[in-house]
């Protein structure tokens, strides 16, 4: 089952996906697609990286993290209800059937009529490391763009890294529901 992520209409959505490069600068191609991961590659590609850089992206989709360090989490700008659905992050590790695929479910909620303060600000203040764009797209921060430094030892989605952690509870309380499938 897919891990579920939530965002409100008009906000930026954040879909986490990470891998650990074998060596600095030794990047693995990654594709992001709308729709579940097919048998090969990504369907309806919205963003793609190669061994060096982001080599394809469409408007509103970018990587806010440092993809050169394996943070290939996808940001979707100014989401609408039509952005709801499953997204595929595929880490295209060379070799025979080596690539890793992750299906992430994005649920878009209607915007609140009267925005009220939430614990989101507390969360942001607690983790001041802001993720900014690299290479293209507007350089901006976002609601869930502030994350603690995590030592990633294996290919994983953020949900795996957050399992049974206090941070997962903070995220859940702040309205960014992560359901561990």
């Amino acid at each position: 089952s897919e891990v579920e992520y939530r965002a409100e209409v008009g906000q930026n959505a954040y879909l986490p996906c990470f891998y650990t490069p074998a060596a600095p600068g030794n990047l693995v191609p990654v594709c992001w697609g709308k729709g579940a991961c097919p048998v090969f590659e990504c369907g309806n590609v919205v963003l793609r990286t190669d061994e060096r850089d982001v080599n394809y992206w469409t408007s509103r989709y970018w990587l806010n993290g440092d993809f050169r360090k394996g943070d290939v989490s996808l940001t979707i700008e100014n989401v609408t209800l039509a952005d709801s659905g499953i997204y595929c992050c595929r880490i295209q590790i060379p070799g025979i059937m080596n690539d890793e695929k992750f299906n992430l479910k994005l649920v878009i909620k209607p915007a609140k009529v009267t925005p009220a303060p939430t614990r989101q600000r507390d969360f942001t203040a607690a983790f001041p490391r802001m993720l900014t764009t690299r290479g293209h797209g507007p350089a901006e921060t976002q609601t869930l763009g502030s994350l603690p430094d995590i030592n990633l030892t294996q290919i994983s989605t953020l949900a795996n890294e957050l399992r049974d952690s206090r941070l997962a509870n903070d995220l859940r309380d702040s309205g960014a529901t992560i359901r561990i499938g």
Epitope: P29, G35, A36, C37, P38, V39, F40, E41, C42, G43, I86, Q92, P94, G95, I96, M97, N98, D99, N103
Partner: antibody, heavy 113, light 108 residues
Framework: QVHLVESGGGLVKPGGSLRLSCTAF????MSWIRQAPGKGLEWLSY????????YYADSVKGRFTISRDNAKNSVYLQMNSLRAEDTAVYYC??????????WGPGTLVTVSS | EIVLTQSPGTLSLSPGERATLSCRAS???????LAWYQQKPGQAPRLLIY???SRATGIPDRFSGSGSGTDFTLTISRLEPEDFAVYYC?????????FGPGTKVDIK
């Protein structure tokens, strides 16, 4: 216009080897698919445009090897330890995510003593 | 692996009639990753439909696909003489890729 052509088929004895070739441009994601006489279609193997990502069906894993030479616009299927049940028409087909929009005409491989 | 079952095995119809071919999957096909192909004797298969309902380039609009989950349908609204052939469905949502056994559409 996409134009795929297979070659290398023929008669081979059980236990023998054969290497099939397919013309394919370097940006094509390619698969080999076979069809035994009077039977349905069976996907065998896939190779990405760069050649870095490879998949095999369990039925041929360890016996068949897919590869490509983009300088020669070619994709290959090396078939070892051939069995009678490998007798089929072998097609190369273009397909990035798993469906195939262009196919070659096929080449017949007959495994018989 | 996902097993695809096609029915009927053979469909005998006359030109001008409507053909409805069924493809059923043993488990749900994610994101409707299902394709349909036409194959005539001595020829390679030809892609008709991908993504369950999208027509491939150059395919006449008398061919249409529908369905999701485990049940998919290929419809030929009015059979032309060149449509008599074998039709295969194929899923590409989960490994390994699998094809159905085919439905033969022949002239009544």
């Amino acid at each position: 216009q996409v134009h795929l052509v297979e070659s290398g088929g023929g008669l081979v004895k059980p236990g023998g080897s054969l290497r099939l070739s397919c013309t394919a441009f370097s940006d094509y994601y390619m698969s080999w698919i076979r069809q035994a006489p009077g039977k349905g279609l069976e996907w065998l193997s896939y190779i990405s445009n760069s050649g870095s990502i490879i998949y095999y069906a369990d039925s041929v894993k360890g016996r068949f090897t897919i590869s490509r030479d983009n300088a020669k616009n070619s994709v290959y299927l090396q078939m070892n330890s051939l069995r009678a049940e490998d007798t089929a028409v072998y097609y190369c087909a273009r397909g990035r995510i798993g469906f195939f929009d262009y196919w070659g005409p096929g080449t017949l491989v007959t495994v018989s003593s | 692996e996902i097993v695809l079952t096609q029915s009927p095995g053979t469909l005998s119809l006359s030109p001008g009639e409507r053909a409805t071919l069924s493809c059923r999957a043993s488990q749900s096909v994610s994101s409707s990753y299902l394709a349909w192909y036409q194959q005539k004797p001595g020829q390679a298969p030809r892609l008709l439909i991908y993504g369950a309902s999208s027509r491939a380039t150059g395919i006449p609009d008398r061919f249409s696909g529908s369905g999701s989950g485990t049940d998919f349908t290929l419809t030929i609204s009015r059979l032309e003489p060149e449509d008599f052939a074998v039709y295969y469905c194929q899923q590409y949502g989960s490994s390994p890729l699998t094809f159905g056994p085919g439905t033969k559409v022949d002239i009544k």
